[in-house]
């Protein structure tokens, strides 16, 4: 059978300051069991952008409905973009465990921020 893939279709996204950025991510399977998280950057210093379970992420909303069954769309929207938000964003599938372990990452989407139109 096919192993789960994490698909980030956009290599790059450009957004004007003050607008919202949509970062697309889909997975190809419901299993293995475990959560999806979003990060900016890679490696041990990466910054957690969204985790459904813990944390407070007031600028992040999920694109799919909160009651959607068998959801495989893990796209997010980040509001009120500023130049400080520029970077590469990764959608990462974790395998459930104690603790959860990283299973597969998307290829990343580079977010660039344009100056606010005057």
């Amino acid at each position: 059978e096919e192993e789960l893939q994490v698909i980030q279709p956009d290599k790059s996204v450009s957004v004007a300051a003050g607008e919202s950025a949509i970062l697309h991510c889909t997975v190809t399977s419901l299993i293995p069991v475990g959560p999806i998280q979003w990060f900016r950057g890679a490696g041990p210093a990466r910054e957690l952008i969204y985790n459904q379970k813990e944390g407070h992420f007031p600028r992040v909303t999920t694109v799919s409905e909160s009651t959607k069954r068998e959801n495989m769309d893990f796209s997010i929207s980040i509001s009120n973009i500023t130049p400080a938000d520029a970077g590469t964003y990764y959608c990462v599938k974790f395998r459930k465990g104690s603790p959860d372990t990283e299973f597969k990452s998307g290829a990343g989407t580079e977010l660039s921020v344009r100056a606010k139109p005057s």
């Epitope: 059978e1 192993e3 789960l4 399977s29 419901l30 299993i31 293995p32 069991v33 475990g34 959560p35 999806i36 459904q52 379970k53 999920t62 799919s64 409905e65 909160s66 009651t67 959607k68 069954r69 068998e70 959801n71 893990f74 395998r95 459930k96 465990g97």
Partner: antibody
Framework: DVQLLESGGGVVQPGGSLRLSCAAS????????MTWVRQAPGEGLEWVST??????YYADSVKGRFTISRDNSKNTLYLQMNSLRAEDTAVYYC???????????????WGLGTLVTVSS | EIVLTQSPATLSVSPGERATLSCRAS??????LAWYQQKPGQAPRLLIY???IRETGIPARFSGSGSGTEFTLTISSLQSEDFAVYYC??????????FGGGTKVEIK
């Protein structure tokens, strides 16, 4: 129509072994996690084990004694039960996992169950 | 492990009356809670998921509410086929998945 049919239950002595099967139809079996839940006579529901693809999860009460597995080519879920104890006596249900949005799993279809009795 | 406590253990209700069943979680489970109905000799049946969403085919007289640690299943007007045992289940933090001890709804 989703159907789950358990088999393999019966009477076994303490310390013995039994292998339960659950034949699934009516959905893409390989795409879903599957779960075993048991119910002792006159008692409530107790989660036993869940399997995703290669990932398996067990209740502490059965860890090291029970093994969950699946054969996607046969659309079948298994539960190998070793070192059985009197307290394992229960109806064993297999259930299909479902998810909502970014959350965990609940169970949207259940089989009719198979009774396992551990007694000398 | 998250403990779910259901109350009352038994609820005696007349047909046509409203039944209110409670499920309390030992810690916050957000909306990650399901309700099941089980009749004697039968498998459980999913009624409600995500605390308030009715499963396809479940009559509108069943409704779920609550979030965090306090949840309610309401049956607005009990029909004869509704007399059964009802279980809540949390799927916020697992393993283990945990179920409440059940509430038996019996005919008054």
């Amino acid at each position: 129509d989703v159907q789950l049919l358990e088999s393999g239950g019966g009477v076994v002595q303490p310390g013995g072994s039994l292998r339960l099967s659950c034949a699934a139809s009516g959905f893409s079996f390989s795409n879903f996690a599957m779960t075993w839940v048991r119910q002792a006579p006159g008692e409530g529901l107790e989660w036993v084990s869940t399997i995703g693809s290669g990932d398996t999860y067990y209740a502490d009460s059965v860890k090291g004694r029970f093994t969950i597995s699946r054969d996607n080519s046969k659309n079948t879920l298994y539960l190998q039960m070793n070192s059985l104890r009197a307290e394992d006596t229960a109806v064993y249900y297999c259930a299909k996992d479902s998810t909502v949005s970014w959350s965990g799993d609940f169970f949207d279809y259940w089989g009719l169950g198979t009774l396992v009795t551990v007694s000398s | 492990e998250i403990v779910l406590t259901q109350s009352p253990a038994t609820l005696s209700v007349s047909p046509g009356e409203r039944a209110t069943l409670s499920c309390r979680a030992s810690q916050n489970v957000k909306n990650d809670l399901a309700w099941y109905q089980q009749k004697p000799g039968q498998a459980p049946r999913l009624l409600i998921y995500a605390a308030r969403i009715r499963e396809t085919g479940i009559p509108a007289r069943f409704s779920g509410s609550g979030s965090g640690t306090e949840f309610t299943l309401t049956i607005s007007s009990l029909q004869s086929e509704d007399f059964a045992v009802y279980y809540c289940q949390q799927y916020y933090d697992w393993p283990p998945f945990t179920f409440g001890g059940g509430t038996k709804v019996e005919i008054k």
